[in-house]
Each structure stands twice: as C-alpha cells, then as structure tokens.
C-alpha cells in the first residue's frame, strides 16, 4: 500500500480551521491478523529524509493522536485530550484519514506528516508516510479562507474548512 497527500501546501488565515488529509492507496489486506495504525506529527524537512523527526502537534505526541483499526474502517480519536487542544483525527471507509486543527495560530505553521503502519504478526513492519506544509498567515496578505495546493500540479483551490 501507499499513502497519497492530495494537497502538499495549505495556506490559511489565522483563526481559521483546517483539515489536513492523507489517503491510503493500493491493495489493503483485510485479513483478521492485519491492523493499521495511523497517526500525525510535526516534523522538519531533513536533508536525507522528510518526516524522520517526530515532534508534537500542539503538545500532543503521535501516540496521543493515533487511529487503530483494520483496513478501510472508520475511526476517530477517542479521548478528549485532543479536542481540548483543538485537534481531532479521523478516518473513513475509503482510506482517507485526516487531522482537523481549529483556531489556527502562526505557531501552527510547519511541516506535518501522516504515518501508516501495517501491523501483521510474523511479517515485516510496513511503514509509509506523507508530508504537507501548513502556512498560517496574518495581516492584509492573508487569504480569507484556506487555499490548498494539489500535490500533482500547481493549481490551487479555495476551501472553507
């Protein structure tokens, strides 16, 4: 399987909400012994590898933000801690999973990574990740809503979170 990031850049005004999205692609084994661990964290663009460093999102670690289920099943963060920090991660039946960040501030700007780990006994641990950039802007140059830039082309889309 692979992870796709529909958008590589999100440009948002301060105070707006944004939903960062990743998509699980390819054949997904739905056997009873296979589960998927999905999570989010902040990182930096490493010289060798993007997403190798794992930093918290609003003081919450990737352990606090994970989703755990089999294949393309729906799930969302179960505890209140994330929501108290204005965060919620969720997953649908189609392989999409996301993190929603509410009331953005300039401190939220940076590189965000989604991670998927396939857990299967007696097999290698299969890990894939996706990366996207969030730019939070303030002042007269800031957009009125979030503007997202697709990963595959330079065309932008306006979205209201």
């Amino acid at each position: 399987f692979k992870v796709a990031t529909p958008y590589s850049l999100y440009v948002c005004p301060e105070g707006q909400n944004v939903t960062l999205t990743c998509r699980l692609l390819g054949p997904v084994d739905k056997g009873h012994d296979v589960t998927f661990y999905k999570t989010w964290y902040r990182s930096s663009r490493g010289e060798v590898q993007t997403c190798s460093e794992r930093r918290p999102i609003r003081n919450l670690t990737f352990q606090d933000l994970h989703l755990h289920h089999g294949g393309h099943q729906a799930a969302n963060t179960s505890h209140d801690l994330a929501q108290r920090h204005g965060l919620e991660s969720a997953s649908d039946h189609h392989g999409n999973f996301s993190i929603t960040m509410r009331n953005l501030t300039l401190l939220d700007s940076g590189l965000y990574c989604c991670l998927v780990v396939e857990i299967r006994h007696h097999h290698s641990e299969h890990r894939v990740h996706g990366a996207m950039e969030l730019q939070v802007q303030t002042g007269k140059d800031a957009p009125s809503n979030c503007v997202v830039y697709p990963s595959s082309s330079q065309e932008s889309e306006n979205i209201t979170a």
């Epitope: 589960t35 352990q63 755990h68 505890h79 801690l81 780990v117 007696h122």
Partner: antibody
Framework: QVQLVESGGGLVKPGGSLRLSCAAS????????MSWIRQAPGKGLEWVSW????????YYADSVKGRFTISRDNAKNSLYLQMNSLRAEDTAVYYC???????????WGRGTLVTVSS | EIVLTQSPATLSLSPGERATLSCRAS??????LAWYQQKPGQAPRLLIY???NRATGIPARFSASGSGTDFTLTISSLEPEDFAVYYC?????????FGQGTKVEIK
C-alpha cells in the same frame, strides 16, 4: 508525562504462577500500545509480549507462548502479565514499556524482579 | 528470528575519547533499528530511533548511522555519564530482538 510502575514480582517455585502489574499515570494510557520486556540477571534484554491499545492484537515470544498471558484494563490504567508454569529461566527483571507501532520502546518502568527457584 | 550481534563486547576508554559501537543483523532490518543506553539498576533509555535519529533530549555527541545489516553508534567525546551498556534493537520483524550489549567502561 506518563509514568510506569511495575509490581507483583517475587520468589516463586518452578511450576508456580505470578501476576505482574504495570500501573500507568496519565489520562492517555488507553491510547498506548505496550510491551513486556525482561532481563535475566547480568544478561541482555528480551522482548516478551505486546498488546495493542484496544487489547487486540496480542503477540508473544516463542519462549513464553502458552504459558504467559498479557492483558490490560484501560479503566484502571493498568497492564498485566499472568505467568504460569514458571521455569528457572524465567528469572529476570520484568519491565513494561510503551511500544507504539512504527516507533521504539520510548517509555519504561523501573522493573520488578521475578525469581523462580526451589 | 533476526539475530543482532554487537561488537566489541566491552570497550575500555577514557573520558573525552571517541567510542564506536557496532551492531550487525543476521538479515536486513531496513532502517528500523534503535539504540538504548542502560546504567546499573536502571531501565534502558532510548537514544536513537530509525537507525540515525536522536530521541528527544539526547545530546548531539551521540550519533548513529547504517541501514540494512550494518549499524554504528558513535559517541564523539565520552562524558563520565556515558559509561554504561548499550543495546541495539530491531523492529523490522517479530519478534523484536536486541543485541547482547556493549559495555563502555572507564579505562
């Protein structure tokens, strides 16, 4: 910051049983995947068992399969290891540790000593 | 299971010297290798994850490299608190396995 504290160790005769506990502080224990790891006196580290945050799946090392049972009670912020049919070679310090998929053992308890001897 | 072999078993060095520890896997573990430090009477502490990344709070004098089957942990200039046992550990396959450890002792 979550802290882990093991208990339940002690001296037991071969063939006997013991139940270890790992108490976690912090409200997010129910989100954490956990392992038990042991270390025989003066020896290296050996992974024993792993449990997901929801209690399934569960994995065991071949050396303990069929004798040890890992479980958890998220309401009590606790992890357990039920050890039956104990052998002399099970003598070790037993550690509980956070073990997230795609990550490492990044948070450990202080350990509890289990001695199997007649 | 994947066997990790660490060398040397013991490294006798003085503070300020450079320590180089090796870990070799019986088959490829990709970059899914970690290094831990353990002091007497204490639980291990995570130093390095994914073969080369320092864990939170680990000083820059610790560095690591490698992929596949050969890995190295380097302590550029030994501090008194660095004398301990160091373990490598792989998570590419079940079961998780550890090396037998390298003891870094004061010369």
């Amino acid at each position: 910051q979550v802290q882990l504290v093991e208990s339940g160790g002690g001296l037991v005769k071969p063939g006997g049983s013991l139940r270890l506990s790992c108490a976690a502080s912090g409200e997010t224990f129910s989100e954490y995947y956990m392992s038990w790891i042991r270390q025989a006196p003066g020896k290296g580290l050996e992974w024993v068992s792993w449990i997901s945050n929801s209690g399934e799946p569960i994995y065991y090392a071949d050396s303990v399969k069929g004798r040890f049972t890992i479980s958890r009670d998220n309401a009590k912020n606790s992890l357990y290891l039920q050890m039956n049919s104990l052998r002399a070679e099970d003598t070790a310090v037993y550690y509980c540790a956070r073990d997230e998929p795609g990550w490492e053992f990044d948070l450990w308890g202080r350990g509890t000593l289990v001695t199997v001897s007649s | 299971e994947i066997v990790l072999t660490q060398s040397p078993a013991t490294l006798s060095l003085s503070p300020g010297e450079r320590a180089t520890l090796s870990c070799r896997a019986s088959q490829s573990v990709s970059s899914y290798l970690a290094w831990y430090q353990q002091k007497p009477g204490q639980a291990p502490r995570l130093l390095i994850y994914d073969a080369s990344n320092r864990a939170t709070g680990i000083p820059a004098r610790f560095s690591a490299s490698g992929s596949g089957t050969d890995f190295t942990l380097t302590i550029s200039s030994l501090e008194p608190e660095d004398f301990a046992v160091y373990y490598c550990q792989q998570r590419n396959n079940w079961p998780r396995t550890f090396g037998q450890g390298t003891k870094v002792e004061i010369k």
